[in-house]
């Protein structure tokens, strides 16, 4: 058991043109957070297919409105680390998908919003105990920094967390055949719990639950002898200290039937009784009917009851695949019109509709500016299926109704300080620096290529040097 | 990380021209307030034109009218034009970016400008 741990480091447009527009305005305030989707494999499958390794939801960000004149490109964050634990062992390669989402916080009917900015996904190896390792993911526009790791959650240690540490019972040394837990030099790696009622003297496991079994014993538990009869066995060399023969190789060792088929000795082979759902010489071959229930997502079967006999799933709407596995993305058919954002609810469509625009496809125009009142003398604008007040100065929001404090987003940089002035802002700067935020500073301190740090540097402004 | 690449400067006499460009990665220039700085052997760096994220521009008053500063977003880089060159103007010119966002500050390595007959 443990945890996989994604820590965002940064979320905005990415280097080159063609910036992606901000998805927050003074008219639109939003926040993001993160969902996180973890697979176990090197797994190609869609992105819609379940989450077996686990998933995880971020805090919601600060809320953020855009600031003319400093933008900031790269969107704020939610605090904290995305944390996805594994109940089983780590699979060492996994498949991720990172999605980054928008809360959108106008005064919208139904409470606030959500649509999907961007989606990054990926397949990677990783050891469990490791250093954090970093990364970085485009989606269109838009880029993603990050970095992950994963831990194992005590007493699992290794790079898989299938080893278990418990505290030394003696000061000194570990008991017989188990190893100190490195980096935890008080502890020592205790014994594996195998499978209950695995035979002590004839089964050993690796992972917790299994039960595998020295040579010359079979069956789940490793108690049958692989010949019962061996003192009359026709194989393997006498033994000088009992008489009796000592089993060599035969034909069920290393179990050749697969799919979790048992394996029984015959005369001249070998013979596999196989599991329901599997038929063949090894158990191979799967005989899946409807029985079996193969249709996901309320697929409904169809097919004969015989192994031989195929079947097929008659897929609901929103799902497809063999066994209707995969989820339809509805939304591609790009159904709601008007620039509305379309949901896929799973057991129905929903289209959210632009200002302006109505209907359960958004195919209704509306008069924008109908029964649409701006306060504090600001104006209304129509166009574009998009009411829009035109505020006063002094005045923003949706409706005009915020007293616009220009000064709220520190606009002024190296210790400036703002003040609201009728046309906007105006920052006062500090001694040493200069430009309309005061951005620049006038004499950068040293006289190499690498300066030090300038006397007015605050802990806010840290330098970054090339 | 923001990384910055100058390149243009030479030799030339007094009264040409040069123009310095300064090439930007990880980082979109539009969001970015850039200037150009230089540094006379002996000399203290000092600051020459920059060019704020709303794209508001600036100068020292010993290179106004001579030198102008400006961006090209698609090219994601910032030039710097330096008209009617004074032996004076001989210096190391580095490029520099402040990220609104992390409020970081970035430099480049630096390119030579000498103005001399």
């Known amino acids: 058991a443990g945890v996989f741990e994604l820590q965002i480091h940064s979320f905005g447009p990415g280097p080159g043109p063609g910036a992606p527009r901000s998805p927050c305005s003074a008219r639109l305030p939003c926040r993001l957070f993160f969902r996180v989707c973890l697979k176990p494999g090197l797994s190609e499958e869609a992105a819609e297919s379940p989450c077996a390794l686990g998933a995880a939801l971020s805090a919601r960000g600060p809320v953020y409105t855009e600031q003319p004149g400093a933008p900031a490109p790269d969107l704020p964050l939610p605090d904290g680390l995305l944390q996805v634990p594994f109940r089983d062992a780590w699979p060492g390669t996994f498949s991720f998908i990172i999605e980054t989402w928008r809360e959108e916080l106008g005064d919208q009917i139904g409470g606030p919003a959500w649509s999907l900015l961007a989606r990054v996904a990926g397949r990677r190896r990783l050891a469990a105990g490791g250093p954090w390792a970093r990364d970085i993911q485009r989606a269109g526009a838009w880029e993603l920094r990050f970095s992950y790791r994963a831990r194992c959650e005590p007493p699992a240690v290794g790079t898989a967390c299938t080893r278990l540490c418990r505290p030394r019972s003696a000061p000194s040394r570990c008991g017989p055949g188990l190893r100190p837990c490195a980096p935890l030099e008080d502890e020592c790696e205790a014994p594996l719990v195998c499978r209950a009622g695995c035979s002590p003297e004839h089964g050993f496991c690796e992972q917790p639950g299994e039960c595998r079994c020295l040579e010359g014993w079979t069956g789940p538990l490793c108690t049958v002898p692989v010949s019962t009869s061996s003192c009359l066995s026709p194989r393997g060399p006498s033994s000088a200290t009992t008489g009796c023969l000592v089993p060599g190789p035969g034909p069920c060792d290393g179990n050749p039937c697969a799919n979790g088929g048992s394996c029984s000795e015959t005369p001249r082979s070998f013979e596999c009784t196989c599991p329901r759902g599997f038929y063949g010489l090894r158990c191979e071959v799967s005989g899946v009917t409807c029985a079996d229930g193969p249709c996901f997502n309320g697929g409904l079967c169809v097919g004969g009851a015989d192994p031989d006999s195929a079947y097929i799933c008659h897929c609901p709407p929103g799902f497809q695949g063999s066994n209707c596995e995969k989820r339809v993305d509805r939304c591609s058919l790009q159904p709601c019109r008007n620039g509305g954002l379309c949901l896929d609810l799973g057991h129905a469509l929903r289209c959210r509709c632009r200002a302006g625009f109505a209907g359960p496809r958004c195919e209704h125009d509306l008069d924008d500016c109908a029964g649409r009142a701006c306060a504090n003398g600001g104006t209304c604008v129509e166009g574009g299926g998009a009411h829009r007040c035109s505020c006063a100065l002094g005045f923003g929001g949706r409706d005009c109704r915020e007293r616009a404090d220009p000064c709220a987003a520190r606009p002024c940089a190296h210790g400036g300080r703002c003040y609201a002035h009728f046309s906007g802002l105006v920052c006062a700067c500090a001694p040493g620096y200069m430009g309309a935020r005061c951005e620049f500073p006038v004499h950068p301190d040293g006289a190499s290529a690498l300066p030090a740090a300038p006397p007015g540097l605050r802990p806010g402004d840290p330098q970054r040097y090339l | 990380e923001v990384q910055l690449v100058e390149s243009g400067g030479g030799l030339v006499q007094p009264g040409g021209s040069l123009t310095l460009s300064c090439a930007a990665s990880?980082?979109?220039?539009?969001?970015?307030?850039m200037a150009w700085y230089r540094q006379a052997p002996g000399k203290k760096r000092e600051l020459v034109a920059g060019i704020s994220a709303d794209g508001s521009t600036m100068y020292i008053d010993s290179v106004k009218g001579r030198f102008t500063i400006s961006r090209d977003n698609a090219k994601n880089s910032v030039y710097l034009q330096m008209n009617s060159l004074r032996a004076e103007d001989t210096a190391v010119y580095y490029c520099?970016?402040?990220?609104?966002?992390?409020?970081?500050?970035?430099w480049g390595q630096g390119t030579l400008v000498t103005v001399s007959s």
């Open positions: 990880g980082s979109s220039v539009k969001f970015l307030s």
């Open positions: 520099y970016a402040y990220r609104w966002h992390t409020r970081y500050t970035y």
